[in-house]
């Protein structure tokens, strides 16, 4: 804080505000009868320079003029942009102990004249909004700079408003607080911005506009949709708009979509009919407005209207499959399965399925409704049966899908040939086959069916299947395919009244099994040893097991073990070997092999055959 200048004065030439790069002379003068009391000639005036309250320089060596004991003039140069404080102090040199006494001080501001403001842009939000203009001020001036926004228009009227920039606030936008009304639509307005500070002034180029150029309509509001006769595909979108709007843009999309449907509507007057909506679909609707067909700006998009279109009766055909199991000599269990319709086919919430099983000749019909995607019934083994399923929502039911119940694997001549399963990547398997060689009736379609080879999978899990046209001989299966799991894959060839099938195992990715089979027993029968084992637990198989290996060697031998390789069959859990010597103790163990390699060995068992073995 500078004390009130009791001892003297400080003046600046040419002025306390100077352009960057200019020099200034600072004069410090003592008032009469002020100074060092005993020895006026010992008065020494010193000038200190402060930036941000920090002393940065003693300008003792910059004196250009000195009236000893009365006044001194200092020249200051290379001042940086912004404000610098100079304090003049009196140093009574005969008294070393007393600090210099402040006389007076002055602030010098260094800056630049304002550049002409550029890029003026004005907007009025809505017919009842007010005009606000923004501009680019150019380089920072480092001085308080006043900006005047001036708008001239019809009726010889000019309005203006002011703001200023300094080191605390920036002025590059002003709201004039005035409204241009539609009756001025044809009028031209001129706006300019003038900048003034202590070092000069400058004016922007005039910027001309019309009402239509700057008025941005308010976005439409109160959006709603009315579905004609509860239709799921036709609706009238309605909204409120400002009175002068002549053009609207509508955009709408299903909520999970990534691209909008766009529609332009002229003179819509807050109403537009949409005819291509998808039933029972969550949609988002937005509207924008414009005041002129060719000129002017679009409003912001309105707030979204989110709504679901009404249901319509399902369309499309259910994909049905079935399984047959004989229960006894005159009864069989039929399990029907079907895939849910996709949303565009279901066109609503599926409430239930109508299932019909019909014996063609005797006209026996079993009917039921279910909410599930499977249905099981026990029926006689005799007769020709057909099944149909349709899906129902609140508006109606789909056309029933029919399938003939045939013995799926009953006709060897219809069995596809050379079925193979190759892993394509982590989550799919390519199945290929050749058509049946001597089919006596035409193949109508192929069904590729698969299920995980895990305990209980037949009862716990429905099958997965793909329908393949008769001229295709391959299928890429991916639904519910996981790596390191073995699947039983069946390819069915179906004619009108018969079926044939071939089976193969496949996996999408494999590793060597975690462990080998566990030998549970070794028994001797008729000069042969029977090795019994338990299969490797399902999670440890890590793919399809191709074969098992039984190893044996004499107990203390260092020779390579002998081995016997057995083709893997899920149903098999014992195997005979006959090349062991009697009364010799052997160590036996087993391993399992997948396409990726061999497992570690399972448990070791010792056995000494008793009888004659050759």
């Amino acid at each position: 804080n500078i004390d009130v200048c009791k001892l003297g004065t400080v003046t600046v030439q040419p002025a306390p505000v100077i352009p960057l790069g200019s020099a200034a002379n600072i004069s410090c003068s003592l008032n009469p009868k002020q100074g060092c009391s005993h020895y006026p000639s010992s008065n020494e005036l010193i000038l200190l320079k402060f930036v941000n309250d920090v002393l940065v320089e003693n300008l003792h060596g910059k004196k250009v003029h000195d009236h000893t004991g009365h006044s001194s003039t200092f020249q200051v140069t290379n001042l940086s942009l912004g404000m610098t404080l100079f304090v003049c102090k009196l140093n009574c040199s005969n008294s070393q102990k007393k600090p210099p006494v402040p006389v007076c001080g002055v602030e010098i501001s260094v800056g630049v004249a304002p550049e002409p403001p550029q890029n003026i842009s004005c907007v009025q939000e809505g017919e009842n909004g007010t005009v606000a203009c923004s501009w680019n001020s150019g380089k920072v001036t480092y001085l308080k700079t006043n900006y005047t926004l001036q708008l001239s228009g019809p009726n010889n009227l000019t309005c203006q408003k002011q703001c200023f920039s300094d080191n605390r606030q920036n002025c590059n936008r002003l709201d004039l607080g005035i409204n241009l009304s539609p009756d001025l639509a044809e009028s031209r307005f001129i706006v300019r911005v003038t900048a003034i500070n202590d070092l000069g002034n400058s004016s922007s180029l005039p910027h001309t506009f019309t009402f239509l150029d700057i008025v941005i309509p308010l976005p439409p509001w109160d959006i709603r949709i009315n579905f004609l006769n509860a239709s799921g595909s036709r609706g009238t979108l309605q909204w409120e708009d400002e009175g002068q709007v002549v053009l609207n843009q509508l955009r709408y999309q299903p909520l999970n979509s990534t691209s909008w449907n766009m529609v332009n509507a002229t003179n819509a007057k807050g109403k537009y009919d949409l005819r291509d909506l998808r039933p029972f679909t969550e949609y988002e609707f937005q509207i924008s407005s414009k005041l002129h067909l060719s000129g002017g700006s679009w409003s912001n998009w309105s707030e979204s209207l989110r709504t679901r279109t009404p249901e319509e009766e399902p369309v499309g055909i259910l994909d049905i499959w079935y399984m047959k199991q004989d229960i006894d000599y005159d009864r069989q269990q039929i399990s029907l399965f079907w895939k849910s319709l996709n949303p565009s086919e279901a066109r609503g919430k599926i409430l239930h399925y109508q299932v019909t099983l019909q014996e063609v000749t005797k006209k026996t019909t079993l009917q039921n409704t279910t909410r599930h995607t499977s249905w099981t019934r026990v029926i006689p083994r005799t007769g020709a049966w057909t099944a149909s399923v349709s899906a129902a929502n609140s508006k109606g039911a789909s056309a029933p899908t029919h399938i003939n119940i045939v013995d799926l694997c009953g006709t060897g001549l219809l069995a596809p040939h050379q079925v193979s399963a190759k892993s394509e990547n982590m989550d799919n398997i390519l199945v290929t086959w050749q058509p049946p060689k001597k089919a006596d009736s035409a193949v109508r379609e192929y069904i590729v069916e698969w299920r995980a080879l895990q305990p209980g999978s037949i009862t716990k899990f429905p099958p997965h299947w793909l329908r393949i046209p008769p001229d295709n001989m391959s299928a890429l299966i991916s639904e519910n395919i996981k790596p390191y799991i073995c699947y039983e894959i069946r390819v069915h060839a179906l004619s009108e009244s018969q079926g044939g099938c071939s089976s193969i195992r496949g996996d999408s990715k494999h590793k060597a099994p975690v462990s080998g089979p566990h030998i549970t027993a070794i028994t001797e029968k008729k000069e042969r040893l029977f090795i019994s084992w338990t299969h490797i637990p399902f999670p440890e198989q890590r793919g399809c097991i191709l074969h098992y290996r039984i190893y044996w060697k004499e107990r203390d031998s260092t020779a390579q073990p002998e081995l016997c390789e057995i083709q893997y069959r899920r149903s098999q859990n014992s195997h005979p070997i006959s090349s062991l010597q009697p009364r010799v103790t052997y160590v036996l163990w087993m391993t399992a092999v997948t396409a990726a390699g061999e497992s570690p060995q399972g448990n070791e068992r010792e056995f000494c055959p008793q009888g004659k073995a050759n």
């Epitope: 007010t130 228009g153 009726n155 009227l157 309005c159 203006q160 408003k161 709201d175 004039l176 607080g177 005035i178 409204n179 241009l180 009304s181 009756d183 001025l184």
Partner: nanobody, 129 residues
Framework: QVQLQESGGGLVQAGGSLRLSCAAS????????MAWFRQAPGTEREFVAG?????????FYDNSVMGRFTISRDSAKNTMWLQINNLKPEDTAVYYC?????????????????????WGQGTQVTVSS
């Protein structure tokens, strides 16, 4: 009772300056629109300058006086001024102070006499050549 009282008029030589004052009493107009009109003999009363009354006060001027006239107000004192520089003989007229009881937002309404609810008696300005 609302009263607007103008003062500061007089006889001035061309090129001179005047500062007209309008003091309002009976009501606060600090946030509302105020304006100066003038009427020369045998002519209609015409708009000279105005203040919109909206936040920050936008000033309006007839193009004929733009740059020479400056309108301002002191809300605390309920007073409005018109600084007139470089007076011309055609500035000779009775100058009236007018006040509205609302903010004037519409560009088109600022210069209309019907926009303003209260008027002063006027102060004579005569410019001699």
């Amino acid at each position: 009772q609302v009263q607007l009282q103008e003062s500061g008029g007089g006889l001035v030589q061309a090129g001179g300056s005047l500062r007209l004052s309008c003091a309002a009493s009976g009501r606060t107009f600090s946030n509302y629109a105020m304006a100066w009109f003038r009427q020369a003999p045998g002519t209609e009363r015409e708009f000279v300058a105005g203040l919109s009354g909206s936040g920050g006060d936008t000033a309006f001027y007839d193009n004929s006086v733009m740059g020479r006239f400056t309108i301002s107000r002191d809300s605390a004192k309920n007073t409005m001024w018109l600084q007139i520089n470089n007076l011309k003989p055609e500035d000779t007229a009775v100058y009236y102070c007018a006040a509205a009881t609302h903010v004037v937002v519409s560009y088109g309404l600022v210069r209309r006499r019907g926009t303003y609810d209260y008027w002063g008696q006027g102060t004579q300005v005569t410019v001699s050549s």
